[in-house]
Amino acid sequence: SIPWNLERITPPRYRADEYQPPDGGSLVEVYLLDTSIQSDHREIEGRVMVTDFENVPEEDGTRFHRQASKCDSHGTHLAGVVSGRDAGVAKGASMRSLRVLNCQGKGTVSGTLIGLEFIRKSQLVQPVGPLVVLLPLAGGYSRVLNAACQRLARAGVVLVTAAGNFRDDACLYSPASAPEVITVGATNAQDQPVTLGTLGTNFGRCVDLFAPGEDIIGASSDCSTCFVSQSGTSQAAAHVAGIAAMMLSAEPELTLAELRQRLIHFSAKDVINEAWFPEDQRVLTPNLVAALPPSTHGAGWQLFCRTVWSAHSGPTRMATAIARCAPDEELLSCSSFSRSGKRRGERMEAQGGKLVCRAHNAFGGEGVYAIARCCLLPQANCSVHTAPPAEASMGTRVHCHQQGHVLTGCSSHWEVEDLGTHKPPVLRPRGQPNQCVGHREASIHASCCHAPGLECKVKEHGIPAPQGQVTVACEEGWTLTGCSALPGTSHVLGAYAVDNTCVVRSRDVSTTGSTSEEAVTAVAICCRSRHLAQASQELQ
Amino acid sequence: QEDEDGDYEELVLALRSEEDGLAEAPEHGTTATFHRCAKDPWRLPGTYVVVLKEETHLSQSERTARRLQAQAARRGYLTKILHVFHGLLPGFLVKMSGDLLELALKLPHVDYIEEDSSVFAQ
């Protein structure tokens, strides 16, 4: 019967008595930077070309005995997970292996850099179809390794890496912390994060998604027909590299940004038990388990968005945090979150010709996060309209006044330390969907976009007194682009998007002694693109 | 995932006012920085990736590497250029004493220097 991990990533329509989804990634080449591999293992023979690249440190210890099967173990298994005949994800993908890890599974940042450079030079000498680079390794945070990954990604290569097996924040490791890399954590058959001895999968905002990574059956270097079960974030990353190969084989023109958005979109949502993660990391860690798309084509009509969290600002009075979208993505909204509730909101601002989301800490606050909603919106023209604090009136308002521009997100930023001490009622006029409304002492920022066929609507859900969390979701066919809270008073900790749901967090009424006039409303802006939908229908 | 992220150490070695002879002074006001792995057991002191500014050509990378070797030799230090990078990042990999870091950070075109470190199969 089909191994659990292949079943988990397979949409129901492909599940027969065996795993054989259409097109096994045959147009794609997957580079594997790992140990040496047994390339003539029955599972992978003819699928893996061993390059002559080798850059590894000496093995530790004077009595180290180099046993071929041990030297090849890690790489052979991963090659099998990516493209193995019987237990592989992308059975049609061809692979090239580079040896950057020694027989003890140890390598160097410099050796990995030289390997990445080798791939880039190979790509220039002999351009082929789409390239996926699998990096099933991790070291401490490395500016240079992250920079090299960024350059390779900007050259059109998809990089997939292991989040790390240290039960720690993936942002402390490289290449896991590189924004351009698709970073993969590991889950088990019960959709629990994988425990590995006393440690386990890494987590946090630098993880893009999770994938099967425990008891994964794959090629064993012990013999040419042997299989073995291995666990780790390397195995998880290999699944995503395989899925990426299949997606790129079906749609070779996909950019890295489009591929990442699709991986997120087609993932199983909210199936991971978050209690395993440290409390402060739960909100930052994506609750996504990778899966193949239900059909290899036809996803183009959707408006894809993802949530990007910034690093923590730190606690100083003027501290700020910045969340950025990828180069091909549009920032459609910006929100902020602080565990202490002491924050001074957020704003969208231009930086290097691109909009970024900046959140502001407040005096006495433990720090803030900026949360960007990053979307794929072809031919978009977006701008930010700002209204300064209204002071005397009921509230500050700003709307999208340009013809054909629609509101995709609202942000508010204030200079006063605590809006909670100024409590005028905030009225939200009905029938004006293109308008952002906020506190009279806050400046309000509206993200206004023009794109072919783009339409948006506002959805609200309010509760009389704060109960920790208010949510509002966009319905089927619509995509959440903006998430904010009304009003911006002190008991609101912030707002953020989780998949297609806008979450507004606030302090419990029991701890704040709030009154019912402090009703908290979650405001979602839901958009869709008629243009993308029509283009997709014309293709079919 | 941010580049400015990470619990890693950044040591900025201040440039001395006196120049080193051969080396042209770096652009005014820019200070090359030194980075090393925050996890001590994973550090590999003695091998360094010297990363040069983005538009640096291969010939300039090679010239900078030779210059470092010459200046190190004058101080009685042996250095070995292990690899010259081009194609992804401009720079070079050098085996040298950590005593030479201050000197290396003053070289023209240098953006930052990172001490080599270990990576592991996951």
Epitope: D40, G46, A68 | -
Partner: antibody
């Protein structure tokens, strides 16, 4: 193009040994093993075993265990199959094929065992 | 390792379709995707026609197709032509080895 070229026909006495060679060209020799398959006159195909061109490991069919030795020489991209203690029922055409996938075959070597 | 079971002979007229079955067990055909089909003309080496159940190597006519259900694999040849007359063998991985079918002689009438 990918080719496997085998050595010429052999006539052997019962109890003797035969060593058949198979020279590979047109691909990376160590990326595949070599399978050996035989076919007795008027009979079907019979898989004898496999040898790794990467590390020399072997996987023999139980029937030939102890009587067959398969080796490779990566310097010449050549695989060898030696069958010992020959009997008359070992008379067959012996084929080498690329890997377990057996996507490319040699032209065959006829081995006749006769007293 | 006992051979996979194939019919000894199959007959078909030009233009017709024929199917050759290959029955194994849950330890070979049923367990692996790696079922191949070979064509052998008299005095010639076998030629791979289908691999991994249903994939056709480049250069092989699309008249040849493969499938699998449970422990039985099948080779279908549509639009029979005179040059299709040959012996056909299936093969499958087993947990440690390879196993062939006994062979099927296809006669084009």
């Amino acid at each position: 193009q990918v080719q496997l070229v085998q050595s010429g026909a052999e006539v052997k006495k019962p109890g003797a040994s035969v060593k058949v060679s198979c020279k590979a060209s047109g691909y990376s020799f160590t990326s595949y093993g070599i399978s050996w398959v035989r076919q007795a006159p008027g009979q079907g195909l019979e898989w004898m075993g496999w040898v790794s061109a990467y590390n020399g490991n072997t996987n023999y069919a139980q029937k030939f265990q102890g009587r067959v030795t398969m080796t490779t020489d990566t310097s010449t991209s050549t695989a060898y199959m030696e069958l010992r203690s020959l009997r008359s029922d070992d008379t067959a055409v012996y084929y080498c094929a690329r890997g377990y996938v057996m996507d490319v075959w040699g032209q065959g070597t006829t081995v006749t065992v006769s007293s | 390792q006992s051979a996979l079971t194939q019919p000894a002979s199959v007959f078909g007229s030009p233009g017709q379709s024929i199917t050759i079955s290959c029955t194994g067990t849950s330890s070979d055909v049923g367990a692996y995707n790696s079922v191949s089909w070979y064509q052998q003309h008299p005095g010639k080496a076998p030629k791979r026609m289908i691999y991994e159940v249903s994939n056709r190597p480049s250069g092989v006519s699309n008249r040849f197709s493969g499938s699998k259900s449970g422990n039985t694999a099948s080779l279908t040849i549509s639009g029979l032509q005179a040059e299709d007359e040959a012996d056909y063998y299936c093969s499958s991985y087993t947990s440690t080895n390879m196993v062939f079918g006994g062979g099927t002689k296809l006669t084009v009438l």
